[in-house]
């Protein structure tokens, strides 16, 4: 078989790479297999870029054409200029190079023309019918930037393989695109992978330094690790850091990404700029800083009091009218001397009775007995030390007065970016597990966005929600998906609430925090795309299918479904992110699977019910949504999207987006 | 000059196998597509399918798949038709032609040279 | 497949006359079309190719036009060595290269 047939193989430089495919395609399948990896048709300007196409090209036979990224519409010559009236398909005839194979002659161009590279001699271009098959196409990759391919060292078993976010594989690369992936293989048995990723400082490197094929294990020089070293079961040594730091980009070493963080209340680390700020119980970001903090007027959300409603700097109070006095749960009025019977008439036999005693609600405690998982966006709730204002009564609401939460701003997730108070926020005093579900709630403004109900029977044990574990390889940046990693957590000891936590993975600098919802900017709106929920959690999810769109209800309602639970003051997103304490390092996160689990609705950013579509929405038809690369996890699996890569430096910088600008013109081309 | 011949039995017994050669001379015989196209007695043209000197490539009209097989010896500038289990229908002048690859600056794949043709009759 | 329906399928002419012949494509095949001159007992010759360049050493009374589904052949002075019979080809690769059934051009 031919040997310049037979792979596709690339050159790249600090800025770009060409890429030949020797697949018969014609001129419109070529420009779309370039742009669905990616990039586009071939555009060499520049002298230098011609040379790097030849050298890619080589001495191929003279019967082979390739497709670059030239064509002319029909009477369109313009034979005194340099490309004859054809356009680049970036939408441009800038040019400082051209090769045509003959002069210009004065015909009337009648027709549309394509242009194909000669793989032979000195690969000139030949104008000819778009509707060709020709023996193979040349696309083109701008980013960024790029890594230059890693030095061999003494104890490698081979080169390193690379592998291009464009999905070519070779050891025959000089520089390396940003989001590539470096494998490198040990003579001891183990091995490494570096990806090309954006440093701190600027630029791009590798995400590891060398050496990559130190000595056996964690004992010499603990493996080059900062603080831990953990010898994988496949052999190889990577390190981890303690609790409230974060591995640096060379991959050994150690930073506190909160050392700096201009946070006024609490610091976190995580999100893209490293940190994310929180605020304490009762307060919320500023919107015009969100490392600033603001009191939350509580007494605005509708039924907070029964009757009466007093706002404090960092909290509020319920009083009651004359003759009326503030029952047990420091919420509800009844007449004086009436106290707790008509609570009780009116909640009805689903609610638990007011006066359990302490042994009952250990009990209580030792029942619930569910696996915890997580879903994106659910409010988080966690036991911490004693905060410095709690709430110390617990809301009972009648089947006509639910909390109403109202429609969030933007700042869940909270915004990323002070005094480091160890990550443990002021938190909702719970006693008892919440059961979450969604109903029709009177909303309290015409802000709140539409609230889609779900209810649920009771479930057994055997129909809990399910523990879902996704393990996903790392990822450059524009590919890393929210992560979705959960395990079972140990049963919460007696008169302690579930905790809901998470830690995020450690991520190179410039990623989207995980577990946020992935938000893209396009023009003036924002999309926010979360991951789909797994298919198969029947009953709960086949309900929330049924009756939800693909992405879940704009509003998050509370229907508190026990006697004793927490009041939550407000659901601006300060307070419903105010409870993130760290787990362990294996990234567990947790949700209480309530043994009458309802709906769990996502709380999101207001969307308009336009956009919600599929997480990826490619704005040309002929594009494809990356699917993520995953370990099979145990089953169910969870199957997350990719946000696609954002466009960057040109000719990629037209992108899908530039697609969508011109997709009348390109469509009338192509 | 540009030349090619084609040559081969003139009669083949129905179900047997018709083996044509085509000889090409005057270019660089990896560097051009080869053709086949046969003409029925009185009627138009068909194309068989053509074959890559360079690469062994081939691309065989539906019509023929699992019956037409096109070889090529580059030593000999040589290619190859066979066409198994003939009948009457087969019986046809069989032609083979290069592929153009450029012409005064355009590529095209239209067939610039043919050969003389060979009559082929199918016949017990 | 991709079909080639040509017209007419014979025509007479006097020395002299312009001559058309038309070739519809069945799909778009761009500018992929050749027109081939066969005289009796010989192989066909090609005059046409990329549906109007005129290929070497091909007089320039015969000339093509045409793009997309629609192609005409011209001589616009019909001599008596054009009798033959003229074909039009389409050879976009895909799925493969088909004729039009031909067209035999006479002398009145």
């Known amino acids: 078989q031919d040997p310049w047939a037979a792979e596709p193989r690339a050159a790249c430089g600090p800025s770009s790479c060409y890429a030949l495919f020797p697949r018969r395609r014609t001129f419109l399948e070529a420009w779309r297999a370039c742009r669905e990896l990616g990039g586009d048709l071939a555009t060499p300007r520049t002298p230098e870029e011609a040379q790097r196409v030849d050298s890619l090209v080589g001495a191929g036979p003279a019967s082979r054409l390739l497709w670059i990224g030239l064509q002319r519409q029909a009477r369109q010559c313009q034979l005194q200029r340099p490309l004859r009236g054809f356009t680049w398909t970036t939408g441009d005839q800038d040019t400082a190079f051209t090769n045509w194979a003959q002069p210009a002659s004065g015909g009337p161009c009648p027709a549309q023309r394509c242009v194909a590279l000669e793989a032979s001699g000195e690969h000139r271009w030949l104008e000819g019918s778009c509707t060709l098959a020709v023996d193979g196409y040349l696309c083109q990759f701008g980013f960024e930037g790029a890594c230059p391919a890693l030095q061999d060292e003494a104890g490698q078993a081979g080169p390193a393989v690379y592998t291009t976010p464009f999905h070519l594989v070779s050891t025959e690369f000089e520089w390396l695109p940003f989001g590539s992936v470096a494998a490198v293989q040990c003579q001891a048995g183990r091995g490494a992978s570096l990806l090309c990723v954006k440093q701190p400082e600027g630029g791009v490197g590798w995400s590891r330094a060398g050496p990559l094929c130190l000595g056996t294990g964690c004992s010499p020089d603990n493996g080059g690790c900062e603080h831990e070293c953990v010898e994988e079961v496949d052999g190889h040594v990577s390190c981890r850091c303690t609790e409230g730091f974060r591995l640096a980009a060379d991959g050994r070493s150690c930073e506190d990404p909160c050392a700096q963080a201009p946070c006024e209340q609490q610091c976190e680390p995580g999100g893209p700029q490293g940190y994310s700020c929180h605020c304490r119980l009762g307060f919320r970001p500023a919107e015009d800083d969100p490392h600033r903090c603001v009191d939350t007027d509580e007494c605005q959300i509708a039924g907070v009091c029964q009757q009466m409603c007093v706002n404090y700097v960092g909290g509020f109070e319920c009083y009651c009218s004359e003759g009326h006095e503030l029952e047990a749960d420091g919420i509800s009025c009844s007449p004086a001397g009436a106290m707790g019977a008509q609570a009780s008439q009116d909640l009805g036999d689903e609610l638990l009775d007011d006066g359990e005693d302490e042994e009952d609600e250990d009990e209580a405690w030792k029942a619930f007995n569910g696996g915890w998982t997580e879903m994106p966006g659910i409010l988080w709730m966690e036991p911490t030390q004693p905060p410095d204002f709690a709430l110390a009564y617990r809301p009972s609401f009648p089947e006509d007065r639910e909390p109403q939460i109202p429609y969030p701003e933007p700042t869940w997730p909270p915004p990323l970016s002070a005094p480091r108070v160890p990550y443990h926020s002021s938190v909702l005093s719970v006693t008892r597990p919440v059961v979450v579900s969604a109903t029709h709630p009177t909303l309290p403004s015409a802000h709140q966005p539409p609230v889609i109900p779900a209810t649920h029977p009771a479930l057994s044990r055997d129909h809990q929600i399910p523990v879902i574990a996704a393990n996903y390889p790392d990822l450059p940046s524009a590919y890393q998906p929210g992560i979705l990693s959960v395990s079972h957590s140990a049963q919460p000891p007696a008169h302690q609430p579930p905790m809901i936590s998470t830690k995020y993975p450690e991520l190179f600098p410039a990623h989207q925090s995980p577990m946020f919802p992935d938000t893209r900017v396009a023009g003036t709106q924002t999309t926010t795309h979360l991951p789909g929920i797994p298919p198969n959690h029947a009953p709960l999810v086949t309900t929330l299918g049924a009756q939800l769109p693909p992405q879940a209800p704009d509003a998050l309602v509370l229907r508190t479904q026990a006697t004793q639970l927490p009041i939550i003051p407000t659901a601006q997103p300060s307070l419903t992110t105010t409870s993130r304490s760290p787990v362990s390092p294996a990234h567990q996160i947790s949700v209480p699977a309530a043994t009458q689990p309802a709906a769990l609705p996502t709380l999101l950013p207001s969307q308009s019910p336009t956009n919600q579509t599929s997480p990826i929405s490619p704005t040309h038809p002929h594009s494809k949504a990356p699917q993520i690369p995953r370990e099979d996890g145990p089953s169910p699996k969870l199957a997350l999207w990719l946000p696609s890569p954002a466009p960057t430096a040109a000719p990629t910088a037209l992108g899908e987006a530039g697609l969508a600008e011109h997709s009348q013109r390109d469509d009338r081309w192509l | 000059q540009v030349q090619l011949q084609e040559s081969g039995p003139g009669l083949v017994r129905p179900s047997q196998t018709l083996s044509l050669t085509c000889t090409a001379s005057g270019y660089t015989f990896t560097d051009y597509v080869i053709h086949w196209v046969r003409q029925p007695p009185g009627r138009g043209l068909e194309w068989i399918g053509y074959i890559n000197p360079y690469d062994d490539d081939t691309t065989y009209n539906q019509k023929f798949k699992g019956r037409v097989t096109m070889l090529v010896d580059t030593s000999s500038n040589t290619a190859y038709l066979r066409l198994s289990s003939v009948t009457a229908e087969d019986t046809a002048v069989y032609y083979c032609?290069?592929?153009?690859?450029?012409?005064?600056?355009?590529?095209?794949?239209?067939?610039?040279?043919w050969g003389q043709g060979s009559l082929v009759t199918v016949s017990s | 497949d991709i079909q080639m329906t040509q017209s007419p399928s014979s025509l007479s002419a006097s020395v002299g006359d312009r001559v058309t012949i038309t070739c519809r494509a069945s799909?778009?095949?761009?500018?992929?079309v050749a027109w081939l001159q066969q005289t009796p007992g010989k192989a066909p010759k090609l005059l046409i190719y990329?549906?109007?360049n005129r290929y070497t050493g091909v007089p320039s009374r015969f000339s093509g036009s045409g793009s997309g589904t629609d192609y005409t052949f011209t001589i616009s002075s019909l001599q008596p060595e054009d009798i033959a019979t003229y074909y039009c080809q389409q050879y976009t690769n895909y799925p493969m290269y088909t004729f039009g059934q031909g067209t035999k051009v006479q002398i009145k």
């Open positions: 990329s549906a109007s």
């Open positions: 799909q778009n095949v761009g500018t992929a």
């Open positions: 032609a290069r592929r153009g690859n450029s012409y005064d600056g355009y590529f095209d794949y239209s067939m610039d040279y």
